[in-house]
Interface confidence: low
């Protein structure tokens, strides 16, 4: 064999014994009849040698190191050659080493031609025996970036201050090219940047520098992932350790092009993002470690790139073609923590136009799909307007307030379904009749169903909320003077199972002057709690509401008020309450701004409770809570 190294080539060749084997017969390098076990050839030297055995590959290895100095002169950038050519070298296991030294301010980029690289962990080996070991430098300290095989996703590695690349080729491997080039870049202001390119579905396992040992203190390392826009990437941490930080925090940051909240910071113990569309960067940041007990920071993670999962391949048809004046919005439900990045969660129209919010309008059939790791992050809000413009046509007309089944079949939770019920002013009023009698939600007897009806005035200038009502009570109907909104609000996913309990009919009825009339038919078993509209804010000025309370023939009703005085202070007018027996028309009138409220009273027949407000002074509002309890007449009430 003859190896001649050109002068000024900065190449050193070293042939030395490899890992010792149990071969009985030793083997030597023979030069000028001398037998040696190590041979070093420097640039400008020419050496002729042979081996003393038939299979030197079982005994020796060869290292070819080229030092590239970018400190004192220009760098030889471009495609890196294998020098000397592999055909001129003895067939030993070969390691080509390129040691590039550069200024701190210079970025160096290794570019790998296809096939790209795949990082391997400790104890792993490459199937074809070809390995790339890459290390960097922080001042005088060598930092291992990682060991890589062929056939992966790593296309580029950027470093600063210097790079050492070792390409190990087994003696039998025919490779005669390095497979990479070097380019100069501006400062990257971090230890290194590893670019990983996905052409299609696949996964990559990557590790922090020095893995499984500790990541250098207070350093920053970035991975850039290039992912086709139609695919989704998810990150999972396979193994990590945290060091003991004295200052700052160890963390990972995600940078997603186009996101308005870059960079987004996660602790290593957090659940990492999934279902990210397109390119993204992940950075690992170390901290200032405790000098006495530093511990180690290390991270091994996997990026999985795949076609969107689960619901995303399902198409849902939302048929609103027979609906009028209706809009359905699918949107993110509010989350408390808003300084955290959460992976994208999108709803798509016709599988093409994807956004975090989507509004569908009536008159069409819509095809939608979802691109979301967790559909509980979305909810639906629906609005429908039922209006009457001609009182002659609408009177006595009824409409069913039901959530259409198309909407219930969507995989997203319904939050609100609001019906806006509009009537011609001073011509018609409305009556709501539930399929199942309703209970008014109060602190004393809260609703515990999976949904409620929220009834409020829909007149812009009027701040009037009648209350929240759920199935399973004593309210048989609610009559309201003018425009209202009725919102079915769900509180639990179990609404899907309880959907059959919903059912409200609205009818247009002749106009009446009171703001609202509640018809109550109490059950003998339970206490009925009722409260004035606008609880906590007070009944609006000059508003009048009534309760029509039925008492069966064999029962007695006990009417109880829950405070001694109403608390209202009138600026103008008077606030009063009338309790009137329906059979005899006998009535008691109480001045709410002066009198104490009545003590519990017993009623043998159906009766009215009417409450009318004055114009109260601010802060002294009218809020009343009362209950009705039925007991059999046979009980001695004395």
């Amino acid at each position: 064999f003859e190896i001649a190294l050109p002068r000024e080539s900065n190449i050193t060749v070293l042939i030395k014994l490899g890992t010792p084997t149990l071969l009985a017969k030793p083997c030597y390098i023979v030069i000028s009849k001398r037998h040696i076990t190590m041979l070093s050839i420097k640039s400008g030297e020419r050496i002729v040698f042979t081996f003393s055995c038939q299979s030197p590959e079982n005994h020796f290895v060869i290292e070819i190191q080229k030092n590239i100095d970018c400190m004192s002169g220009p760098c030889p950038f471009g495609e890196v050659q294998l020098q000397p050519s592999t055909s001129l070298l003895p067939t030993l296991n070969r390691t080509f080493i390129w040691d590039v030294k550069a200024h701190k301010s210079i970025g160096l980029e290794l570019q790998f031609s296809i096939p790209r690289l795949r990082q391997i962990g400790p104890g792993e080996s490459c199937p074809d025996g070809v390995t790339h070991s890459i290390s960097g430098r922080i001042d005088a300290t060598v930092v291992r970036i990682g060991t890589f095989c062929s056939n992966g996703t790593v296309s580029r590695i950027k470093m600063q201050e210097g790079v050492k690349m070792a390409l190990h080729l087994p003696w039998f491997h025919p490779r005669n090219v390095s497979g990479f080039s070097i380019a100069n870049r501006s400062s990257i202001k971090r230890l290194c940047i590893i670019e990983s390119v996905f052409e299609g579905e696949g996964s990559a396992t990557l590790m922090s520098a020095n893995y499984p040992e500790g990541f250098p203190e207070d350093e920053l390392m970035t991975w850039q992932f290039v992912v086709p826009a139609h695919l989704r990437a998810s990150v999972s941490f396979l193994n990590f350790n945290l060091s003991n930080c004295e200052r700052k925090e160890e963390r990972v940051e995600y940078y997603i092009p186009g996101s308005t909240t870059n960079p987004e910071v996660f602790k290593l113990e957090d659940k990492q993002p999934g279902n990210m569309a397109g390119n993204f960067n992940l950075s690992l940041q170390g901290c200032d470690q405790d000098a006495q007990s530093p511990g180690i920071l290390r991270l091994q993670f996997q990026v999985l790139v795949q076609h969107p999962q689960n619901e995303s391949n399902k198409i849902y048809v939302v048929d609103l073609s027979n609906e009028r004046a209706m809009s359905l919005t699918i949107e993110p439900r509010p989350v408390k923590q808003s300084r955290k990045f959460v992976p994208g969660c999108f709803v798509c129209l016709e599988s093409r136009t994807c956004s975090s919010n989507l509004t569908l309008t009536s008159g069409s059939k819509h095809k939608i799909s979802f691109l979301c790791d967790d559909l509980t992050r979305l909810w639906m809000n629906v609005e429908k307007t039922i209006s009457c413009t001609d009182h002659r046509y609408c009177q006595r007309k009824s409409y069913s307030l039901q959530v259409p089944s198309d909407i219930l079949h969507l995989p997203v939770e319904l939050h609100d379904f609001s019906w806006k019920l509009l009537v011609p002013k001073d011509r018609l009023s409305l009556v709501l009749v539930p399929a199942q009698k309703l209970q008014q939600h109060t602190h004393e007897k809260p609703c515990n169903t999976s949904f409620s009806y929220l009834v409020a005035s829909a007149i812009p200038s009027q701040d009037l909320y009648f209350g929240s009502f759920c199935p399973g009570g004593s309210i048989k109907q609610i009559q309201v003077k003018q425009n209202i909104s009725v919102t079915l609000r769900t509180f639990a996913p179990s609404f899907q199972q309880e959907a059959s309990r919903q059912g409200l009919t609205v009818s247009f009825i002749p106009y009446f002057k009171e703001e609202g009339v509640f018809t109550v038919t109490p059950d003998t078993k339970s206490k009925v709690y009722l409260r004035t509209p606008n609880w906590d804010r007070g009944l609006p000025s000059l508003t009048s509401v009534s309760w029509n309370i039925s008492v069966p023939r064999d029962q007695v009703a006990c009417l109880t008020f829950f405070k001694e005085r109403s608390g209202v202070v009138c600026q103008t007018g008077r606030a009063f309450m009338i309790i009137q027996e329906q059979r005899t028309r006998a009535e008691e009138i109480f001045s709410l701004d002066e009198d104490v409220l009545p003590k519990p009273s017993f009623h043998h027949h159906s009766f009215w409770v009417n409450i009318s407000n004055c114009s109260p002074t601010s802060g002294k509002q009218l809020d009343l809570l009362f209950s009705v309890t039925l007991t059999p007449r046979t009980v001695d009430l004395t």
Epitope: L220, E253, E264, V265, Q337, S338
Partner: antibody, heavy 119, light 111 residues
Framework: EVKLVESGPGLVAPSQSLSITCTVS????????VHWVRQPPGKGLEWLVV???????TYNSALKSRLSINKDNSKSQVFLKMNSLQTDDTAMYYC?????????????WGQGTTVTVSS | DIVMTQTPASLAVSLGQRATISCRAS??????????MHWYQQKPGQPPKLLIY???NLESGIPARFSGSGSRTDFTLTINPVEADDVATYYC?????????FGGGTKLEIK
Amino acid sequence: EVKLVESGPGLVAPSQSLSITCTVSGFSLTTYGVHWVRQPPGKGLEWLVVIWSDGNTTYNSALKSRLSINKDNSKSQVFLKMNSLQTDDTAMYYCAKNYRNYDYAMDYWGQGTTVTVSS
Amino acid sequence: DIVMTQTPASLAVSLGQRATISCRASESVDSYGNSFMHWYQQKPGQPPKLLIYRASNLESGIPARFSGSGSRTDFTLTINPVEADDVATYYCQQSNEDPYTFGGGTKLEIK
């Protein structure tokens, strides 16, 4: 269009407390944090406190014992209260929108409200 | 607290020339690969206006005459070329650690 409008009493007697309201429009308090910064006449800027979108707060430790901040998301209002005012609390008080969730810079500022501490 | 020292306190520059304002932090304001240093412009009778965020990023709508550079403790705001409309006081601010502190300001005038 993003707008922040501060409203305050103008004149406060020494040892009394100060309440200022910042009413915002064009963005939601559930998405962005709001900072308070003050500037004494002819002097530089001093950061006081921030209330984040999730309701968490970060105070300037030097003033923490005298400051309190809260907000009403539905009314798009942020309230600053400062106790035990002295003449050196005389300043222009600004509220400002947090730029991005992670930068803690301030990209939109109100016109400020002048607070004079004098008997 | 991190103390921000701005130099010079005032600066007079001819129209069309370059203005350079320095800001030095008493400790590093870098975290996680980012410098949490921002620059504001304040004209008399007006609130401050964000020019540069995170040391070198130009806020949208701000002319490219303004640029920022630096890391860790030393930062620079450069205006090149200076225009008449740039007469104002310029402040640096760090947001790496609370309390988020401002520099004392640099008043820019035209020669």
